[in-house]
């Protein structure tokens, strides 16, 4: 529906609190380096303007698009060129090019200091002194570090963040109450950010059709009792929501997401029996709950898929009449029968089916040609099954830390040109698949593992895209969204790689390692491991294990020493020499 004033429409729909929060998120995701106070000032100006439009939709500038209003506001920032360089050139453009320009300058790895958590008492004081500013700061800090974070979901995180402080700052043991909650929010937040980053990459790099295919498969698994027409409607609406959020249209996105949640709850009888509890919750919780809801039970007596998609004489006619609808029905029917498959596997099967029909429907005897198409699915299904089985066995044998190390070595050998911090971050996340998914029964392992790996490999792809260094990474990231994981799995040791020059400084450690958390200490060791592999890509597992065991013993010994720094200096030199000898450097 056309509204005289879009900004007034969204302000009224969302309410002032959500409006302000979403504008702050939008601005922080665009101008990631701007100080908090500058953003708050811009948000307040936009909010005041929106209120004038609510009072009189015909007032000056109220008819302008949100992109125009927000872009004009961002372009008033005085230090734009000094802080952002060429991003300032966006301001010379007209909409919609200006917004596209801002989007292209979003930085997945902004040069921002790590968020250090203050003492609990300090945080509680800040929370009590000015709750509103405290929560705005949370939105700002998360949004600028995660420029694709799903904005309506960030509102949900902020609500939980507020609830944690409200409860725990009154508790007898504030820290015991608060810290686990903050850890949980941090971990969930990182996961949520990464999942949304994949959705945006899917839309932006592979187009709406790719995203819709993903959504058909996932929603069909989740809502197997829903009719195809119902799933198609949900997919269309969900695609609109995510297209808006990934495009920076956060007000529209949040508004449309609320409408979608409302529709789902009003029609839950024809969608899923699992929605009842979700639909009793307030809006933000409701939307989150629906997004995470468990798969409904499959309908009994689902007929064979082969009847309509292989045995029918009308396959080519149906395909020719409406290719995407027919393939969508195939994907829907296959996915609702296979909650045990990953979404990416289902998409590979649909792609194989499509390729077969393209070839066979032009053949002399189409039916004879496509009659065995389902046989082609077998190896595609078995490949991830076998891979997950092997890796879960390895995880159970090694435990998470050593499993991560095995992956660090594996991936560094595949793509040694990638920066060490990226290899460490990505391999650590890949390694988390073990504790996340291997505990599940067979029927849940593949969807858990392979779809999680898609999210993690997308992190590698977006980080690599910023500064491309490996043709192999570029190839795996850009050729096919659904074949990224098999593409990386298939990579062998890069024989063209020239080993990195040995630099003793890389392997020089100091007493500060002793005060690090267990996680930070692991990262230090894993960084060293990646560097070792980069120096000696042909090193065997045994050689690397020996060096890493020596390294762990060295850190433990020096952290127990009276004069830690001297120990690190002297024992460190010995360790480097011994390691060089062991690896033949």
């Amino acid at each position: 529906d056309a509204h005289k004033s879009e900004v007034a429409h969204r302000f009224k729909d969302l309410g002032e609190e959500n409006f302000k929060a979403l504008v702050l998120i939008a601005f922080a995701q665009y101008l990631q380096q701007c100080p908090f106070e500058d953003h708050v000032k811009l948000v307040n100006e936009v909010t005041e303007f929106a209120k004038t439009c609510v009072a009189d939709e015909s007032a000056e500038n109220c008819d302008k698009s949100l992109h125009t209003l927000f872009g004009d506001k961002l372009c008033t920032v005085a230090t734009l060129r000094e802080t952002y360089g060429e991003m300032a050139d966006c301001c010379a453009k007209q909409e919609p090019e200006r917004n596209e320009c801002f989007l292209q300058h979003k930085d997945d790895n902004p040069n921002l200091p790590r968020l250090v958590r203050p003492e609990v008492d300090v945080m509680c004081t800040a929370f009590h002194d000015n709750e509103e500013t405290f929560l705005k700061k949370y939105l700002y800090e998360i949004a600028r570090r995660h420029p694709y974070f799903y904005a309506p979901e960030l509102l949900f995180f902020a609500k939980r963040y507020k609830a944690a402080f409200t409860e725990c700052c009154q508790a007898a043991d504030k820290a015991a109450c608060l810290l686990p909650k903050l850890d949980e929010l941090r971990d969930e937040g990182k996961a949520s950010s990464a999942k949304q980053r994949l959705k945006c990459a899917s839309l932006q790099k592979f187009g709406e059709r790719a995203f819709k295919a993903w959504a058909v498969a996932r929603l069909s698994q989740r809502f197997p009792k829903a009719e195809f027409a119902e799933v198609s409607k949900l997919v269309t609406d969900l695609t609109k929501v995510h297209t808006e959020c990934c495009h920076g249209d956060l007000l529209e996105c949040a508004d449309d997401r609320a409408d979608l949640a409302k529709y789902i709850c009003e029609n839950q009888d024809s969608i899923s029996s699992k929605l009842k509890e979700c639909c009793e919750k307030p809006l933000l919780e409701k939307s989150h709950c629906i997004a995470e809801v468990e798969n409904d039970e499959m309908p009994a007596d689902l007929p064979s898929l082969a009847a309509d998609f292989v045995e029918s004489k009308d396959v080519c006619k149906n395909y020719a009449e409406a290719k995407d609808v027919f393939l969508g029905m195939f994907l829907y029917e296959y996915a609702r029968r296979h909650p045990d498959y990953s979404v990416v596997l289902l998409l590979r099967l649909a792609k194989t089916y499509e390729t077969t029909l393209e070839k066979c429907c032009a053949a002399a005897d189409p039916h004879e040609c496509y009659a065995k198409v389902f046989d082609e699915f077998k190896p595609l299904v078995e490949e991830p099954q076998n891979l997950i089985k092997q890796n879960c066995e390895l995880f159970e044998q090694l435990g998470e830390y050593k499993f991560q190390n095995a992956l660090l070595v594996r991936y560094t050998k595949k793509v040694p040109q990638v920066s060490t911090p990226t290899l460490v971050e990505v391999s650590r996340n890949l390694g988390k698949v073990g504790s996340k998914c291997c505990k599940h029964p067979e029927a849940k392992r593949m969807p858990c593992a392979e779809d999680y790996l898609s999210v993690v490999l997308n992190q590698l792809c977006v980080l690599h895209e910023k500064t491309p260094v490996s043709d192999r990474v570029t190839k795996c990231c850009t050729e096919s969204l659904v074949n990224r994981r098999p593409c990386f799995s298939a990579l062998e040791v890069d024989e063209t790689y020239v080993p990195k020059e040995f630099n003793a400084e890389t392997f020089t450690f100091h007493a500060d390692i002793c005060t690090l958390s267990e996680k930070e200490r692991q990262i230090k060791k894993q960084t060293a491991l990646v560097e070792l592999v980069k120096h000696k890509p042909k090193a065997t597992k045994e050689q690397l294990k020996a060096v890493m065991d020596d390294f762990a013993a060295f850190v433990e010994k020096c952290c127990k020493a009276d004069d830690k720094e001297t120990c690190f200096a002297e024992e460190g030199k010995k360790l480097v020499a011994a390691s060089q000898a062991a690896l033949g450097l």
């Epitope: 195809f228 007596d301 689902l302 007929p303 064979s304 898929l305 082969a306 009847a307 309509d308 998609f309 292989v310 045995e311 029918s312 004489k313 009308d314 396959v315 006619k317 149906n318 029905m329 029917e333």
Partner: antibody, heavy 121, light 110 residues
Framework: EVQLVESGGGRVQPGGSLRLSCAAS????????MGWVRQAPGKCLEYIGI???????YYASWAKGRFTISRDNSKNTLYLQMNSLRAEDTATYFC???????????????WGQGTQVTVSS | IQMTQSPSSLSASVGDRVTITCRSS????????LSWYQQKPGQPPKLLIY???DLASGVPSRFSGSGSGTDFTLTISSLQPEDFATYYC???????????FGCGTKLTVL
């Protein structure tokens, strides 16, 4: 007992609409393609269309646009929605189960007894 | 698509061998997607033969079908009293929209 029972027939004025039902018992309606066939008094059998196990519908060219086949798996019932009815649509309407699942083979091995539709003013 | 049955009516006696033919204006699907039905007054049709020559479940072996492409035959080797009825052929074609019935052959007692 495996059977099909049609209902919903009757007298209707030209231009009117009617929805016929076909209740299946003893088997799942969605396990085979299900079709509708009609027979005017003392005339030939005439194929109307079919719905496949996956819900694809196929209609005789003359029926396309006016007639719609659907089913409700939860009720194990097949439907024929008929719009803009004419005098020449007067016939006994049969629902039938095809040997195939995904298309019409023309081999209907289970039939209902039929329901009479009369279109007249 | 036209299905032409001949003859349109036929008289015969118990014990006779009877042949009914069906011709389609186009080849049926796979050259064999043709069925034969028997219908008695006030009853729905009953499937006798499918895929041109396969006997439907519970149908006596005196009924047989043959043919391919556009020309098909239903044979009753030795007429029984209960066989006097109208016989229809039906063809399946390359599209499910094109399924068609013949207009029947009425078999009566001579």
């Amino acid at each position: 007992e495996v059977q099909l029972v049609e209902s919903g027939g009757g007298r209707v004025q030209p231009g009117g609409s009617l929805r016929l039902s076909c209740a299946a018992s003893g088997f799942s309606l969605s396990s085979n393609a299900m079709g509708w066939v009609r027979q005017a008094p003392g005339k030939c059998l005439e194929y109307i269309g079919i719905i496949s196990v996956g819900g694809f519908t196929y209609y005789a060219s003359w029926a396309k646009g006016r007639f719609t086949i659907s089913r409700d798996n939860s009720k194990n019932t097949l439907y024929l929605q008929m719009n803009s009815l004419r005098a020449e649509d007067t016939a006994t309407y049969f629902c039938a189960r095809d040997r195939h699942g995904g298309d019409s083979s023309g081999a209907f091995y289970l039939w209902g007894q039929g329901t009479q539709v009369t279109v007249s003013s | 698509i036209q299905m032409t049955q001949s003859p349109s009516s036929l008289s015969a006696s118990v014990g006779d061998r009877v042949t009914i033919t069906c011709r389609s204006s186009e080849s049926v699907y796979s050259n064999n997607q043709l069925s034969w039905y028997q219908q008695k007054p006030g009853q729905p049709p009953k499937l006798l033969i499918y895929d041109a020559s396969d006997l439907a479940s519970g149908v006596p072996s005196r009924f047989s079908g043959s043919g391919s492409g556009t020309d098909f035959t239903l044979t009753i080797s030795s007429l029984q009293p209960e066989d006097f009825a109208t016989y229809y052929c039906a063809g399946g074609f390359s599209s499910s929209s094109d399924t068609a019935f013949g207009c029947g052959t009425k078999l009566t007692v001579l």
